[in-house]
């Protein structure tokens, strides 16, 4: 067990803060909830603190919760590939470029680290080149989320990881908006981190609303499990 992994044996409170600017539309979001890495479970509620969110909530899910991949459930035989927990408590910087097919792109930079007992994800997001009447600024996405696989590989040069995946957002007319994600994670501290073999995270996300909440918001329930590396031969013959 890595030193960082010990911090995730129980339920951990999570705070998410985001500052966004998409095509000049500024907004801020605050999220609170908890994570339980034993089950790879995240429960979070996000509120736009600046009125109405100028982009659809589903386009921010990866920035929020795929940002705290330290809550992913890594099975026993894969624990040595869990970069995310091993970087804690000092944390990691997570940078992404998200290309929305036939539309604009988001660039994000986040610092994910422990502050006391709370796991904090602070994010800055800049979006450019979006069409004013496109799927994103035109709010044409359905309020739901598909399951995805998130592919992880070691980046030995930077003592971190590279992550690639493609999100499929459902559009109201029945079609799909693709969003290509290119991600890089580097540790904030200078302690040792686990550099993984290639594997993937299997994610399932459910979006809902709080019937008693008047503000523009999103309630998120997510389960994330690491997979893609089989038991070694020594495991099989135990």
């Amino acid at each position: 067990m890595s030193k960082g992994e010990e911090l995730f044996t129980g339920v951990v409170p999570i705070l998410v803060e985001l500052d966004g600017d998409v095509n000049g539309h500024k907004f801020s979001v605050s999220g609170e909830g908890e994570g339980d890495a034993t089950y790879g479970k995240l429960t979070l509620k996000f509120i736009c603190t600046t009125g109405k969110l100028p982009v659809p909530w589903p386009t921010l899910v990866t920035t929020f919760s795929y940002g705290v991949q330290c809550f992913s459930r890594y099975p026993d035989h894969m624990k040595q590939h869990d970069f995310f927990k091993s970087a804690m408590p000092e944390g990691y910087v997570q940078e992404r470029t998200i290309f929305f097919k036939d539309d604009g792109n988001y660039k994000t930079r986040a610092e994910v680290k422990f502050e006391g007992d709370t796991l904090v994800n602070r994010i800055e997001l800049k979006g450019i080149d979006f069409k004013e009447d496109g799927n994103i600024l035109g709010h044409k996405l359905e309020y739901n989320y598909n399951s995805h696989n998130v592919y992880i590989m070691a980046d030995k040069q930077k003592n971190g990881i590279k992550v690639n995946f493609k999100i499929r957002h459902n559009i109201e007319d029945g079609s799909v908006q693709l969003a290509d994600h290119y991600q890089q994670n580097t540790p904030i501290g200078d302690g040792p981190v686990l550099l993984p073999d290639n594997h993937y995270l299997s994610t399932q996300s459910a979006l809902s609303k709080d019937p008693n909440e008047k503000r523009d918001h999103m309630v998120l329930l997510e389960f994330v499990t690491a997979a893609g590396i089989t038991h070694g031969m020594d495991e099989l013959y135990k």
Epitope: E17, S28, S30
Partner: antibody, heavy 117, light 106 residues
Framework: QVQLVESGGGLVQPGGSLRLSCAAS????????MHWVRQAPGKGLEWVSG????????YYADSVKGRFTISRDNSKNTLYLQMNSLRAEDTAVYYC??????????WGQGTLVTVSS | ELTQPPSVSVAPGQTARISCSGD??????VYWYQQKPGQAPVLVIY???ERPSGIPERFSGSNSGNTATLTISGTQAEDEADYYC???????????FGGGTKLTVL
């Protein structure tokens, strides 16, 4: 306990500048958005400016846009308001306030800014 | 824009009601602040009808349609103050205040 203490107010001539500070204590400053609200003598409350917890997004009332700049130093637990090209109508008590999601939950005691020749 | 009556008078022990109106105000949360002379405002109601700790139970709030109301039951002399309603806006005027109501306890 949670405390906000403003400083930097005073008498300034029209067209002059002033920098207000707000020292925060008793809470984790970096987790809260912060705002400035003013109150002209005998008048109501007027929102002036706000800044997000991270500090990269700032917001201004039309009446001060281009003249005032809000900023924060999370390492010093301090909020600032740089006021340039001051006008007589900027005369007011300026309150520093903590923003909890979509409302102010804590106010400082205020600092008086008087713009007069 | 939020509209409040400039003044409301009430006898001690009676119920004071201060209104705050605005377009579709019931679809947003309303907050109420009390301000005594020479002092900073104090939050007395948040989220339409929630009371912060330390605020007496006689303070309550409601909000529906175009009008929010602050109700002070069994008004006391110490409740004499200016009261401001507030809400949030989507056009990056992040806080909108009503003009304020001076409550006089006769």
């Amino acid at each position: 306990q949670v405390q906000l203490v403003e400083s930097g107010g005073g008498l300034v001539q029209p067209g002059g500048s002033l920098r207000l500070s707000c020292a925060a204590s008793g809470f984790t400053f970096s987790r809260y958005g912060m705002h400035w609200v003013r109150q002209a003598p005998g008048k109501g409350l007027e929102w002036v400016s706000g800044i997000s917890s991270i500090g990269s997004n700032t917001y201004y009332a039309d009446s001060v846009k281009g003249r005032f700049t809000i900023s924060r130093d999370n390492s010093k637990n301090t909020l600032y308001l740089q006021m340039n090209s001051l006008r007589a109508e900027d005369t007011a008590v300026y309150y520093c306030a903590r923003w909890y999601k979509t409302y102010i939950d804590v106010w400082g005691q205020g600092t008086l800014v008087t713009v007069s020749s | 824009e939020l509209t409040q009556p400039p003044s409301v008078s009430v006898a001690p022990g009676q119920t004071a009601r201060i209104s705050c109106s605005g377009d579709n105000l019931g679809k947003k949360y309303v907050y109420w602040y009390q301000q005594k002379p020479g002092q900073a405002p104090v939050l007395v109601i948040y989220g339409d009808d929630e009371r912060p700790s330390g605020i007496p139970e006689r303070f309550s709030g409601s909000n529906s349609g175009n009008t929010a109301t602050l109700t002070i039951s069994g008004t006391q002399a110490e409740d004499e103050a200016d009261y401001y309603c507030a809400s949030y806006d989507s056009s990056h005027i992040l806080i909108v205040f009503g003009g304020g109501t001076k409550l006089t306890v006769l």
